[in-house]
């Protein structure tokens, strides 16, 4: 049953632990069939989600999936919080689950976790050459 509905693949209770001062890319995986939908990011403020205007975003196209990316260059302490992506497609609004960023302020962190430390803590997934990491419950 291959549906042509737009799908946003952000799982419920999705979380990322990141460090202030590092670059970070928040990805919204998008599946669409023909025309790429218009996708936006918003940040939750209580029950309302405030659209993020004037923020750097980009698309990354892969074979069976596309990613609408919100760039943090760099991560700031007040980037802490929950985000949601939304797609407008054929006058339908499709909303993702929220994904939460937990930002650790480097000033308050005693020391950045080393690669060895991360290897011993498998829930911290070290990605690329950046010093950010992900944390999934």
């Amino acid at each position: 049953k291959e549906s042509c509905d737009v799908q946003l693949y952000i799982k419920r209770q999705s979380e990322h632990s990141i460090l202030a001062g590092d670059p970070f890319e928040l990805e919204c995986p998008v599946k669409y069939c023909a025309n790429r939908p218009h996708v936006t990011w918003c940040k939750l403020n209580g029950t309302t989600c405030v659209k993020l205007e004037d923020r750097q975003t980009s698309w990354k196209e892969e074979k069976n999936i596309s990613f609408f990316i919100l760039h943090f260059e760099p991560v700031l302490p007040n980037d802490n919080g929950s985000y949601r992506c939304s797609a407008n497609f054929q006058s339908n609004l499709i909303e993702s689950h929220s994904t939460t960023l937990y930002v650790t302020d480097v000033k308050s962190a005693s020391e950045r976790p080393s690669k060895d430390e991360m290897a011993s803590r498998p829930w911290l997934l070290y990605r690329h050459h950046h010093h950010h990491h992900h944390h999934h419950h």
């Epitope: 049953k1 799908q7 929220s98």
Partner: antibody, heavy 121, light 112 residues
Amino acid sequence: QVTLKESGPTLVKPTQTLTLTCTFSGFSLSTFGMGVSWIRQPPGKALEWLAHIYWDDDKRFNPSLKSRLTITKDTSKNQVVLTMTNMDPVDTATYYCARGNWDGETYFDYWGQGTLVTVSS
Amino acid sequence: DVVMTQSPLSLPVTLGQPASISCKSTQSLLDSDGKTYLNWFQQRPGQSPRSLIYLVSKLDSGVPDRFSGSGSGTDFTLKISRVEAEDVGVYYCWQGTHFPWTFGQGTKVEIK
């Protein structure tokens, strides 16, 4: 054509660890949106969701059993393995694996035939 | 945990007549993404469960259109417009909005 099949021991002793394998075909667990859940059904009783593994290896567990459960996937073999420690006679049930498809979130659209596991000394 | 309560637990029906099963949840199943993750499954005697309906009212592939689902919030209904002999079995509702995902206790449909 999507199929799932459970395999494992039919009889385990109390305190032993149960290991069940779900072998599937017709889909890939590396595809975005895909997942596999384990669900059990004691004889003559209702269904109980146990654990789920997503395409990106993220996992969810029923909190009432979380300390006893592990779930892993082998994408190349098209298999998902559930282990349950410290088995007890109350864990006697038919254990099913089901495909988690995605429409905004997971829903179970295909189920295996189930395997009856009896816990007895 | 969200408790799913089905009624009736046993439903004797006449062939060709309609049937209706209720499912109530202890919390609203409307998710923050605007969707309601309420599904219905059929389990025929001696068989595995089979998906009938997802997202309250979407019919799964291969499911006859005599089945329909409706409801919102905490109250949901599965309807069979004209019961056929192959519809005998146990029907379960399931919620996927809150972890842990939970099933109803089942409704046994049998022919009078």
